[in-house]
Interface confidence: low
């Protein structure tokens, strides 16, 4: 007996071939011997089966001795043995129809779980293997669960159902609602304007919700709310903002915040949360601000950074076009009695310069100039 696998909602074509390459009489019946369809001369006749309107054939193939049964908009209950009677022969085809659905909405928040449920006909024992967009394979029976969805899980999940050494493939589009980056670091010299951007990693027609930025300054003992805002159909409106610092917020997506100037007391890390309408849970993005200051006081040239720096970062002071005078994995470096010239303070990570501040040291009778 031939086995054919079908997908719920799809169309399947079951083949039936006669030895004579001409139009002869044929009938398709189900396992209960109820006629589905057949022919009378060149006319297609239908029987009383529940398939009725969903069953068809290809009259153009009859003259070649081919009498297919086409079933549209497949249902799980269409799983059955179908019998083609032609030339005193009976050809049996077992049709097994499977469905695969996401248990909930296909738009899920980062960190939430995805459960895929397989609908299968009674008596079948399929195995399922799904491949996520990032190439991760998961296997299971009637249900497959993926906990802690990540941004890379957004996209088309390809699931293969295996039964009787035959397979059928399902594609399910999953959208993981998240910010493009889980975390970002902004490096600024003291006094510079700071731009924080929070691009979303998905696009939807209407986006409504509310958000807040909490900030933990390195110098502060506790965190505080810097700004709260609403989002209505992708339009941003500020609800409340602190006076110090007085953040400004863009009115359109992507979410965009401007800090008028980077100061050591603002250096630290923040957490922007966004609660979306009709979704449980929140989206999070961490943002970090590192501030650099280069100063000369009497005979001491100092370079300092504030904020969350990794121990791998290197802070250096060097006279322009010369080797670094001092390089340390610390948050402050200094040179006593610096020679005159343009000094560079560099914060770097494995050769990549993250932040650079220049300070001009004048001969000892003058005061320093900050370019």
């Amino acid at each position: 007996k031939k086995v054919v696998l079908g997908k719920k909602g799809d169309t399947v074509e079951l083949t039936c071939t006669a030895s004579q390459k001409k139009s002869i009489q044929f009938h398709w019946k189900n396992s209960n011997q109820i006629k589905i369809l057949g022919n009378q001369g060149s006319f297609l006749t239908k029987g009383p089966s529940k398939l009725n309107d969903r069953a068809d054939s290809r009259r153009s193939l009859w003259d070649q001795g081919n009498f297919p049964l086409i079933i549209k908009n497949l249902k799980i209950e269409d799983s059955d043995t179908y019998i083609c009677e032609v030339e005193d022969q009976k050809e049996e085809v077992q049709l097994l129809v499977f469905g695969l659905t996401a248990n909930s909405d296909t738009h899920l928040l980062q960190g939430q779980s995805l459960t895929l449920t397989l609908e299968s006909p009674p008596g079948s024992s399929p195995s399922v293997q799904c491949r996520s967009p990032r190439g991760k394979n998961i296997q299971g029976g009637k249900t497959l669960s993926v906990s802690q969805l990540e941004l890379q899980d957004s996209g088309t999940w390809t699931c293969t159902v295996l039964q009787n050494q035959k397979k059928v493939e399902f594609k399910i589009d999953i959208v993981v609602l998240a910010f493009q980056k889980a975390s970002s670091i902004v490096y600024k010299k003291e006094g510079e304007q700071v731009e924080f951007s929070f691009p979303l990693a998905f696009t939807v027609e209407k986006l409504t919700g509310s958000g807040e930025l909490w900030w933990q300054a390195e110098r502060a003992s506790s965190s505080k709310s810097w700004i709260t805002f609403d989002l209505k159909n992708k339009e941003v409106s500020v609800k409340r903002v602190t006076q110090d610092p007085k953040l400004q917020m863009g009115k359109k997506l992507p979410l965009h915040l401007t800090l008028p100037q980077a100061l050591p007391q603002y250096a630290g890390s923040g957490n922007l949360t966004l609660a979306l309408e009709a979704k449980t849970g929140k989206l999070h993005q961490e943002v970090n601000l590192v501030v650099m200051r280069a100063t000369q006081l009497q005979k001491n040239l100092t370079c300092e950074v504030w904020g969350p720096t990794s121990p791998k970062l290197m802070l250096s002071l060097k006279l322009e076009n010369k080797e670094a005078k001092v390089s340390k994995r610390e948050k402050a470096v200094w040179v006593l009695n610096p020679e005159a010239g343009m000094w560079q303070c560099l914060l770097s990570d494995s050769g990549q310069v993250l932040l650079e501040s220049n300070i001009k040291v004048l001969p000892t009778w003058s005061t320093p100039v900050q370019p």
Epitope: S310, Q344, L346, D349, S350, G351, Q352, V353, E356
Partner: antibody, heavy 121, light 111 residues
Framework: DIQLQQSGPELVKPGASVKMSCKAS????????INWVKQRTGQGLEWIGE????????YYNENLKDKATLTADKSSNTAYMQLSSLTSEDSAVYFC??????????????WGQGTLVTVSA | DIVLTQSPASLAVSLGQRATISCKAS??????????MNWYQQKSGQPPKLLIY???NLESGIPARFSGSGSGTDFTLNIHPVEEEDAATYYC?????????FGGGTELEIK
């Protein structure tokens, strides 16, 4: 789309110099170090040095320090490497490369197609 | 300088089988819980292509049949199942210490 486009092959005489280019596109040129890597025919890879186009700061592999000079032109988003006093040992393919952004920030994620230098009398 | 020794220098693997390439460093390439070892694939006439960074992280766009493991001084690149297009030379590279250095390479042939 981040791309590094290198200049074409060079045939040079022993003792001469050669200057090759690496034009960057698809990102802010002054934000990332450009590295240079040497590969002799049928052999492995050797790091030559790096230049930070933002400030012009450069850093060299001590073993190759007097051979290469690295420069960068911010206006054209192009990095250059000049090799001097060429010998047959300098016949190789030279790649420019850039590191990645996130977890792969210490690996060469983007490469130029390479410039073949042949030193021959 | 940190010396990286790759083995074997060449290997031939049947289609669909597993290829294993080893890289030993002359000193530890670990720092603060991370391993600064990367793996590259290079085909003839092409630049190297990043496969694995920080010992075990798969670079975006690289098939999941490539995997990396190890820490300290001993690292491994695995390819399973090997496909015809995997015929290439593979290099390990450390980025913990300047100058960064590469292994001597392993040439993979598909049988």
């Amino acid at each position: 789309d981040i791309q590094l486009q290198q200049s074409g092959p060079e045939l040079v005489k022993p003792g001469a110099s050669v200057k090759m280019s690496c034009k960057a596109s698809g990102y802010t040129f002054t934000d990332y170090v450009i590295n240079w890597v040497k590969q002799r025919t049928g052999q492995g890879l050797e790091w030559i040095g790096e230049i930070y186009p933002g400030s012009g700061s450069d850093y060299y592999n001590e073993n190759l320090k007097d051979k290469a000079t690295l420069t960068a032109d911010k206006s054209s988003n192009t990095a250059y490497m000049q090799l001097s006093s060429l010998t047959s040992e300098d016949s190789a393919v030279y790649f420019c490369a850039r590191k990645g952004e996130n977890g792969n920030s210490l690996a060469f994620a983007y490469w130029g197609q390479g410039t073949l230098v042949t030193v021959s009398a | 300088d940190i010396v990286l020794t790759q083995s074997p220098a060449s290997l031939a693997v049947s289609l669909g089988q597993r290829a294993t390439i080893s890289c030993k460093a002359s000193q530890s390439v670990d720092y603060d819980g991370d391993s600064y070892m990367n793996w590259y694939q290079q085909k003839s006439g092409q630049p190297p292509k990043l496969l694995i960074y920080a010992a075990s992280n798969l670079e975006s766009g690289i098939p999941a049949r490539f995997s990396g493991s190890g820490s300290g001084t001993d690292f491994t690149l695995n390819i399973h199942p090997v496909e015809e297009e995997d015929a290439a030379t593979y290099y390990c590279q450390q980025s913990i210490q300047d100058p960064c250095t590469f292994g001597g390479g392993t040439e993979l042939e598909i049988k």
